[in-house]
């Protein structure tokens, strides 16, 4: 392993998964590295092998149990180390005392569906996946709608500052194809970040009735 600029970032999905990304400038692609997890108040230790995701970036998932099991709490601390093989020994390349509920990134929302669609509006609902019951209602959402001829990056963000798993999109154009995405973030945690965007939901508004004003 080389002493280039490094970055080690991990997130807890609030249930039973810690996902980590390790990057290092100038590191060799075939370097053998792993993440080792050592909790302060649990009987398990966990290791996952870092697998290449790009030229100088590796990732792995520490799977702590069944997807919906609550494996860590707000008082847990898990010491995470990146260990890379150097000859016959392992070298500590990065270390952190990981506080799961300070470093949250939930799974992308799922089960998006059109509840009701009209000419100018559409009501959409979704569900959150593998989210801890600890959050109660302390979640927020961002949503975006892809209009014809635009990119996702150009789509304005709609913010829902509460746990509201539906939205009514208005001022839509009749008989037009749209796509919709949503993401979620807990309010808790200094280093918490947004979930990935959901899979896009495609929908089409109803055509305007003939002879009516649009």
């Amino acid at each position: 392993a080389v002493n280039g600029t490094s970055q080690f970032t991990c997130f807890y999905n609030s249930r039973a998964n810690i996902s980590c990304v390790w990057s290092q400038d100038g590191a060799l692609q075939d370097t053998s590295c792993q993440v080792h997890a050592w909790p302060d108040r649990r009987r398990w230790n966990q290791t996952c092998e870092l697998l290449p995701v790009s030229q100088a970036s590796w990732a792995c998932n520490l799977i702590l149990g069944a997807p919906d099991s609550q494996k860590l709490t707000t008082v847990d601390i898990v010491t995470l180390r990146v260990l890379c093989r150097e000859g016959v020994r392992w070298r500590v390349m990065a270390i952190q005392d990981f506080k799961p509920f300070e470093n949250l990134r939930l799974m992308a929302p799922i089960s998006l569906q059109v509840v009701h669609v009209e000419t100018h509006r559409c009501n959409i609902s979704w569900e959150i996946s593998q989210a801890s019951h600890y959050f109660e209602r302390h979640l927020e959402f961002e949503a975006r709608t892809l209009s014809p001829g635009h990119t996702w990056e150009e789509a304005p963000l709609l913010t829902l500052k509460q746990k509201q798993e539906w939205i009514c999109l208005e001022t839509l154009t009749p008989d037009t194809q749209y796509e919709f995405q949503v993401r979620v973030k807990p309010l808790q945690g200094e280093f918490t970040t947004w979930s990935p965007w959901s899979q896009p939901l495609a929908f089409r508004t109803k055509p305007a009735a003939l002879g009516k004003d649009t």
């Epitope: 280039g4 302060d40 010491t79 990065a94 506080k99 200094e190």
Partner: nanobody
Framework: QVQLVESGGGLVQPGGSLRLSCAAS????????MSWVRQAPGKELEWVSS????????HYADTVKGRFTISRDNDENTLYLQMNSLEPEDTAVYYC???????????????????RGQGTQVTVSS
């Protein structure tokens, strides 16, 4: 704003001990890795030791290993450096430094430091 205030330096004879303290404020101390660095007269800044945010991991420069001990009290927002068997070569201004996250990188311990204090002078001389 982030504030780091070192204390505990002074004049000590070779073989003696000192305990440095660093009082931290302006950020959630328990969420960040910390370190001690030092600068001897006319020399570059030198890394001494680092500690993880909850104190479960520590690393030391070879020059101080076995003599210095880094620790922290997250309830008191204070970082410590216990220095034993002091040598004249340990004479320097000692700075407490904050990392930009909970992570530090032992092979490149200078990486990611974003704040340091004003320092406290340690002089080892007979």
């Amino acid at each position: 704003q982030v504030q780091l205030v070192e204390s505990g330096g002074g004049l000590v004879q070779p073989g003696g001990s000192l305990r440095l303290s660093c009082a931290a404020s302006g950020f959630t101390f328990s969420n960040y890795a910390m370190s001690w660095v030092r600068q001897a007269p006319g020399k570059e800044l030198e890394w001494v030791s680092s500690i993880t945010s909850a104190g479960r991991g520590t690393h030391y420069a070879d020059t101080v290993k076995g003599r210095f001990t880094i620790s922290r009290d997250n309830d008191e927002n204070t970082l410590y450096l216990q220095m034993n068997s002091l040598e004249p070569e340990d004479t320097a201004v000692y700075y407490c430094a904050k990392y930009s996250s909970a992570t530090y990188y032992p092979p490149t311990p200078a990486q990611g430091r974003d704040y340091r204090g004003q320092g406290t002078q340690v002089t080892v001389s007979s």
